[in-house]
């Protein structure tokens, strides 16, 4: 789903207050609800009628350093006989998410938010067949 | 997919540098790749064999303020005849994502990362039938 544009108002102080110095803000250390965990069904990527594989990208200057991307294994969907049926389509489900980018020069470290597009998994859909012009 | 624990090392300065004052860091204003957009298919939530609905939660002190959660419409999956087949299961696909929480007291504004569990959509899976002991 979409993350709306910041419009940079969210990160600004109220108008009656002095502006943020140097175009940066104070980010408190620690993450709220850090222990919260995905409780997804086991192996759904293999058991799905629109199965997918995972690829892990790693970047030590990003938090989280590990970002996992899904790729649909098939163009069609897997039917009850375990065969691919191309009259149905496996399609990716995408999500916009935020990560934190670390920038450092010597002992000066700053952080910036970055928007990343993640394919989370796949679902099986009835294709839309538009009428031929 | 899972966001690993920070271990608070990501946000620390190198050991040879003076520690971060007051347990906070500098977060630059602006978002990298802010214009990047999900290019997900129209109406896949209705065209899926495991269809879902969306619920929007709104919080003005969170960025993004709008977080969209999916809920599977059915326990089973929709077959070629448009009927629910309960021999298959519609299951949620979840993703851990980061949001930014704004905290203010008067003109003092700070921000903190927060982990949020988002259900992005649903997929149709073959159920795991455990044998009775």
């Amino acid at each position: 789903r979409k993350i709306p544009k910041v419009g940079h108002t969210f990160f600004q102080k109220p108008e009656s207050c002095p502006p943020v110095p140097g175009g940066s803000m104070k980010l408190d250390i620690g993450i709220i609800n850090e222990n919260q965990r995905v409780s997804m069904s086991r192996n759904i990527e293999s058991r799905s009628t629109s199965p997918w594989n995972y690829t892990v990208t790693w970047d030590p200057n990003r938090y989280p350093s590990e970002v996992v991307q899904a790729q649909c294994r098939n163009l069609g969907c897997i039917n009850a006989q375990g065969k691919e049926d191309i009259s149905m389509n496996s399609v990716p489900i995408q999500q916009e998410t935020l990560v934190v980018r670390r920038k450092h020069q010597g002992c000066s470290v700053s952080f910036q938010l970055e928007k990343v597009l993640v394919t989370v998994g796949c679902t099986c859909v009835t294709p839309v067949i538009h009428h031929v012009q | 997919r899972k966001i690993p624990k920070v271990g608070h090392t990501f946000f620390q300065k190198p050991e040879s540098c003076p520690p971060v004052p007051g347990g906070s860091m500098k977060l630059d204003i602006g978002i990298i790749n802010e214009n990047q957009r999900v290019s997900m298919s129209r109406n896949i939530e209705s065209r899926s064999t495991s269809p879902w609905n969306y619920t929007v939660t709104w919080d003005p002190n969170r960025y993004p303020s709008e977080v969209v959660q999916a809920q599977c419409r059915n326990l089973g999956c929709i077959n070629a005849q448009g009927k629910e087949d309960i021999s298959m299961n519609s299951v949620p696909i979840q993703q851990e994502t980061l949001v930014v929480r704004r905290k203010h007291q008067g003109c003092s504004v700070s921000f903190q990362l927060e982990k949020v569990l988002v259900t992005v959509g649903c997929t149709c899976v073959t159920p795991v039938i455990h044998h009775v002991q």
Partner: nanobody, 119 residues
Framework: EVQLVESGGGLVQAGGSLRLSCPVS????????LGWFRQAPGKEREFVAV????????SYADSVKGRFTFSRDNAKNTMNLQMNSLKPEDTAVYYC????????????WGQGTQVTVSS
């Protein structure tokens, strides 16, 4: 704007071969999916073959597996359908199509080319 134009259809005897081609203009060739469909008289349009734009995956309808081959010529932005061992039941109007988003939303279509297989 994406434009698709098929060529290569015609009349052929059972057991013969034809090669259909479809140049794809615009950005559809580098994103989404490409496909060949067919529609026989009085029947619904059906998938014949479909490929991911990257060429990484290609899938075929059971009725054509082992006889038809989907290929793409990246240099010419063209998709091709090599049809061997043709049968009378392969008689149909063949369409190339593109799904711009890998979404199962087949938006772009050629005008179709007739393939007739006589026994």
């Amino acid at each position: 704007e994406v434009q698709l134009v098929e060529s290569g259809g015609g009349l052929v005897q059972a057991g013969g071969s034809l090669r259909l081609s479809c140049p794809v203009s615009g950005r559809a060739f580098s994103r989404g999916r490409l496909g060949w469909f067919r529609q026989a008289p009085g029947k619904e349009r059906e998938f014949v073959a479909v490929a991911h734009w990257s060429g990484a995956i290609t899938s075929y309808a059971d009725s054509v597996k082992g006889r038809f081959t989907f290929s793409r010529d990246n240099a010419k932005n063209t998709m091709n359908l090599q049809m061997n061992s043709l049968k009378p039941e392969d008689t149909a109007v063949y369409y190339c199509a593109a799904d711009s988003e890998t979404s199962g939303n087949w938006v772009y279509w050629g005008q179709g080319t007739q393939v007739t297989v006589s026994s």
